[in-house]
């Protein structure tokens, strides 16, 4: 399955939107910095494309879930947030189309269980952090920066997969 060129453009647009969503300086939130333990090894280049697609899908789905909450709606600009949802939704569709085409359907669910679990637990930590910080502006800024970093890392994986072909 070839992810359309528009998919990587969408990834770049998603990162741009995340950058534009910034409301306060991260430097004013240094005391709120947190290591969320992004499971980078689960996005390593050793996987075949068929194996990475469900993990990338999970990553984007979890980002969508995180920013779809009412607490998130209160924290960010509504117009930017709507554009952000649209980009994520399109990327989910692209990845789902690949799965439907039968890429790795037989082995994927079991093979990638651990990677998908690692991603879900990463977002559990982010969700709990926000709750502990009472969804403060600084907490959301820390999370926005973290999602930019982790999304960028997973996007780099997509690009490396494209270039390998």
């Amino acid at each position: 399955c070839d992810l359309p060129q528009t998919h990587s453009l969408g990834s770049r647009r998603t990162l741009m939107l995340l950058a534009q969503m910034r409301r306060i300086s991260l430097f004013s939130c240094l005391k709120d910095r947190h290591d969320f333990g992004f499971p980078q090894e689960e996005f390593g280049n050793q996987f075949q494309k068929a194996e990475t697609i469900p993990v990338l899908h999970e990553m984007i789905q979890q980002i969508f879930n995180l920013f779809s909450t009412k607490d998130s709606s209160a924290a960010w600009d509504e117009t930017l947030l709507d554009k952000f949802y649209t980009e994520l939704y399109q990327q989910l569709n692209d990845l789902e189309a690949c799965v439907i085409q039968g890429v790795g359907v037989t082995e994927t669910p079991l093979m990638k269980e651990d990677s998908i679990l690692a991603v879900r637990k990463y977002f559990q930590r982010i969700t709990l952090y926000l709750k502990e910080k009472k969804y403060s502006p600084c907490a959301w800024e820390v999370v926005r920066a973290e999602i930019m970093r982790s999304f960028s890392l997973s996007t780099n994986l997509q690009e490396s997969l494209r270039s390998k072909e």
Epitope: E113, D114, L128
Partner: antibody, heavy 123, light 108 residues
Framework: QVQLIQSGPEVKRPGASVKVSCKAS????????INWVRQAPGQGLTWLGW????????GFPQKFKGRVILTSDTSLNTAYMEVSRLTSEDTAVYFC????????????????WGQGTTVIVSS | DIQVTQSPSSLSASIGDRVTITCRAS??????INWYQHKPGKAPKLLIY???VLQNEVPSRFSGSGSGTDFTLTITSLQPDDFGTYYC??????????FGQGTKVEIK
């Protein structure tokens, strides 16, 4: 309530290997990881590693990488821990314990434990 | 790796006393901490998970608190059955974990 039943005590020579089994009384492998923990005489609890019985994936603290092997036979509902190159410092009671793979309540505690297997390493 | 440091290493208290055991993590682990009671010749028993949630059938005299790096296990009124060694365990990057060194509780 599910039970984890471990194999019996072992006496081994230094340099040898030991394999301990941990059988679940009912299927718990789809929803739980199996962990191994040991307690040496007069010491505290030490975590040895985790196993996802359905995928075979494992994880270990640095100290035990390469010397502890964790495997399972899902058809037998049994997990195994093998420790190689045994020394007297490996004399301990070894426990298996389960933990949820994913918990909405953040419950990542070891809620069910085996009864323990005593391993003595002596020349 | 994340380390957890427990204190005190041992304590002696009378029946009815309030007992407090502390655990400090080497980094912010939110509330990913569990507490166990371990008696000689038995398997450890999970008392509290997620820093403050009492496991099923654990007496209400046990309670846990804390968040970030500092955590506390409290026994409000020590009972004869409460002797043993208590351990904290961090599960921030579950399924990886680590245990504290333990606190031995003796009855005076």
């Amino acid at each position: 309530q599910v039970q984890l039943i471990q194999s019996g005590p072992e006496v081994k020579r230094p340099g040898a290997s030991v394999k301990v089994s941990c059988k679940a009384s009912e299927n718990t492998f789809d929803t739980h990881y199996i962990n191994w923990v040991r307690q040496a005489p007069g010491q505290g609890l030490t975590w040895l590693g985790w196993l996802n019985p359905t995928t075979g994936k494992t994880g270990f603290p640095q100290k035990f990488k390469g010397r502890v092997i964790l495997t399972s036979d899902t058809s037998l509902n049994t997990a195994y821990m093998e420790v190689s190159r045994l020394t007297s410092e490996d004399t301990a009671v070894y426990f298996c314990a389960r933990v949820l793979k994913l918990s909405d309540e953040y419950n990542y505690g070891f809620d069910v434990w085996g009864q323990g297997t005593t391993v003595i390493v002596s020349s | 790796d994340i380390q957890v440091t427990q204190s005190p290493s041992s304590l002696s208290a009378s029946i009815g006393d309030r007992v407090t055991i502390t655990c400090r993590a080497s980094q912010n682990i939110l509330t990913f901490i569990n507490w166990y009671q371990h008696k000689p010749g038995k398997a450890p028993k999970l008392l509290i998970y997620a820093a403050s949630v009492l496991q099923n059938e654990v007496p209400s005299r046990f309670s846990g608190s804390g968040s970030g790096t500092d955590f506390t296990l409290t026994i409000t009124s020590l009972q004869p059955d409460d002797f043993g060694t208590y351990y904290c365990q961090q599960t921030y990057l579950t399924p990886q974990c680590s245990f504290g060194q333990g606190t031995k509780v003796e009855i005076k």
